[in-house]
Amino acid sequence: EEELQVIQPEKSVSVAAGDSATLNCTVSSLIPVGPIQWFRGAGPGRELIYNLKEGHFPRVTAVSDPTKRNNMDFSIRISNITPADAGTYYCVKFRKGSPDVELKSGAGTELSVRAKPS
């Protein structure tokens, strides 16, 4: 059986302050069952950016319907970007459990924020 891949196609994305940023992520398989979460940064200090199951993320929306059967696109859109949003974003697949277990991370997408054109 082919190993699950978490694909973040863009190494970097540059966005003007105030605009929206789209961070792309797809998975190569629906198996194993489990959620996708987005983080900024890596390691124990990473910041949770988006989790479908719980939490309130007012500036983050899913590009595709994350509840749809057979959905393999877990891209997100972050609105009203500010310089504080700069960093490397990771799309991470978890295996469903109690608790969920981290399975595989994408390679990361570095978001850089340009000054708003005057």
Partner: antibody, heavy 124, light 106 residues
Amino acid sequence: AVTLDESGGGLQTPGGALSLVCKGSGFTFSSHAMNWVRQAPGKGLEWVAGISSDGRFTYYGAAVQGRATISRDNGQSTVRLQLNNLRAEDTATYYCTKNGGCGSGGDLDCIDAWGHGTEVIVSS
Amino acid sequence: ALTQPASVSANPGETVEITCSGGGSNNAYGWFQQKSPGSAPLTVIYDNGKRPSDIPSRFSGSKSDSTGTLTITRVQAEDEAVYYCGSADNSGAGVFGAGTTLTVLG
């Protein structure tokens, strides 16, 4: 108990428009995807349209694509189906359905509750 | 559309299986009972094998490969109905089978 109450059916004229409303109660409406399913006289079940729990994503069956709009108001616990340019083939009983905590619009395997249905007759 | 047998029959107390195939890869199946035309369908199984709280345990569902199966053990006269399976195709569109008429003999 979960209840889904449809309204808005009745006699419609060809080329006209109809608006069906389904009111849900007995469950957390905003947590569940919803679908509309219809059944023409003497025929089987046909999926019409569906909508995700937050209303951001909508899905339509081939027979109504371009003529239908599904929307929801989670504050009022209602889902609405608007169908334009009505044809005789739209004559059917229309059922509102609720997904049971899985899937989204179109994911019929997740339907766990049905309304009583509202009859629509398209005739001149 | 999904593929299911047009009809099945069983004697009271027997076990009957109704199959359904043709859903999208990795998709699940639901099963809906309609006792008479024009009456509202009732979900007996959803998400492959989950049973709504008001449905007797005689009804069960399973999925193997891409085929879903509804199993009714100890069939009773009141189970006589048309059973529809439902799923989504690979494009995400909802699809039903044409329905299977269950006749309880005797």
